[in-house]
């Protein structure tokens, strides 16, 4: 365990990291669910999209999200890894031209319509915390992750490495 300062030092390079290619290295269409198997769903309401975390009925179809994966280079002076350090970043798009965005001021996760190149708020560092789960860390705010709060997605500050396995920031990806 390396405590609060360790997590921030470990991820501080996110502020300066650059996406090494404008094209994703791979893309994956998947449904997104929580550690407790609740589905992440998207609904168009009053010309804007809302994001929900809910239990689906047995035969209800899950919403799909296009995950686009990008390589991002650590600046060598930050990572301590020379030119070697790389991170895997992801953008999440549930429908054409809309992407999940981190709103760090409101601690919220929102769907915004935008054109490429996407803003930094649409990029999340992918973490494997658990054998079959992933977590999404804000590129613009190291130590802050997409999480579940009151049946909605929210931004959750994780202040120590022990809390990185907390269930509310763990998500499952599935083709079904």
């Amino acid at each position: 365990a390396f405590g609060i300062s360790g997590v921030q030092k470990y991820t501080r390079a996110l502020h300066d990291s650059s996406i090494t290619g404008i094209s994703p290295i791979t893309e994956y269409l998947a449904s997104l669910s929580t550690y407790n198997d609740q589905s992440i769903t998207f609904a168009l309401e009053d010309e804007s999209y809302e994001i929900y975390v809910e239990d689906l009925k047995k035969d209800e179809k899950k919403d799909k999200v296009l995950l686009s994966y990008y390589e991002s280079q650590h600046p060598s002076n930050e990572s301590g890894d020379g030119v070697d350090g790389k991170m895997l970043m992801v953008t999440l798009s549930p429908t054409k031209d809309f992407w999940l965005h981190a709103n760090n001021k409101e601690h919220s996760v929102e769907l915004h319509k935008c054109e490429k190149p996407l803003p930094d708020q649409a990029f999340f560092v992918l973490h494997n915390m658990h054998s079959n789960c992933v977590s999404f860390e804000c590129k613009t705010d190291p130590g802050v992750f997409i999480g579940v709060k009151d049946n909605h997605l929210a931004l959750i500050k994780v202040d120590s490495s022990e809390n990185l396995c907390t269930e509310n920031i763990l998500f499952k990806l599935s083709e079904t």
């Epitope: 390396f2 470990y10 990572s79 301590g80 890894d81 992918l126 973490h127 054998s131 860390e137 490495s161």
Partner: antibody, heavy 122, light 107 residues
């Protein structure tokens, strides 16, 4: 330059214990997924155990669960594999490896040590 | 656990030939597959990651393709230094499992 150097291998009797070390240099160990892989005589590669950089979560293949323990010492930038209740089928060259990406194992393993030989025999 | 089935187990070829090795996963692994080269007494060398991304420093005669469950490693224009054993590895979820290996031998 990234370097991984394994040590601690040797001859041990069935039921015995060994502790393997992997000294890392040129990068911060805790920032990456680290992985132990073995190759038995005349056999293929087999993943043994991994540890997540971000959370420190640990993972084991079924055949070593309850017998092997992976850990790391961040201050010494060193990875360990404690092997107890060793069996003849654990005889292999053991490699440590570092992930391509920090925070995820999705990209596989880019840097490898030269390996250390563990022989379990009476 | 995800099983990885690699074929062929061995292939005899000449310098300059094109070699194709296939790997099949027992369940969908998206594009999370890596290919390694292993020579006796040496550490494994990463060739391809994320199914088709060429690792830095690896010659462009190596290429990878596929997604889902079926993947291919192609060596076009085999060089003398390419005779080795090649392994696929699913990097989707732990335990990260390897294929049985393909030995590329001189004809």
């Amino acid at each position: 330059e990234v370097q991984l150097v394994e040590s601690g291998g040797g001859l041990v009797q069935p039921g015995g214990s060994l502790r393997l070390s992997c000294a890392a240099s040129g990068f911060t160990l805790r920032s990456y997924v680290m992985y132990w892989v073995r190759q038995g005589p005349g056999k293929g590669l087999e993943g043994v155990s991994g540890i997540s950089g971000s959370s420190g979560g640990t993972y084991y293949t079924d055949s070593v669960k309850g017998r092997f323990t992976i850990s790391r010492d961040n201050s010494k930038n060193t990875l360990f594999l404690q092997m107890n209740s060793l069996r003849a089928e654990d005889t292999a060259v053991y490699f440590c490896a570092r992930s391509v990406y920090s925070t995820t194992w999705y990209g596989g393993f880019q840097h490898w040590g030269q390996g250390t030989l563990v022989t379990v025999s009476s | 656990d995800i099983q990885m089935t690699q074929s062929p187990s061995s292939v005899s070829v000449s310098v300059g030939d094109r070699v194709t090795i296939t790997c099949r996963a027992s369940q969908v692994i998206s594009s999370w597959l890596a290919w390694y080269q292993l020579k006796p007494g040496k550490a494994p060398k990463l060739l391809i990651y994320a199914a088709s991304s060429l690792q830095s420093g690896v010659p462009s005669r190596f290429s990878g393709s596929g997604s889902g469950t079926d993947f291919t490693l192609t060596i076009s224009g085999l060089q003398p230094e390419d005779f080795a054993v090649y392994y696929c590895q699913q990097t989707n979820s732990f335990p990260l499992t390897f294929g049985g290996g393909t030995k590329v031998e001189i004809k």
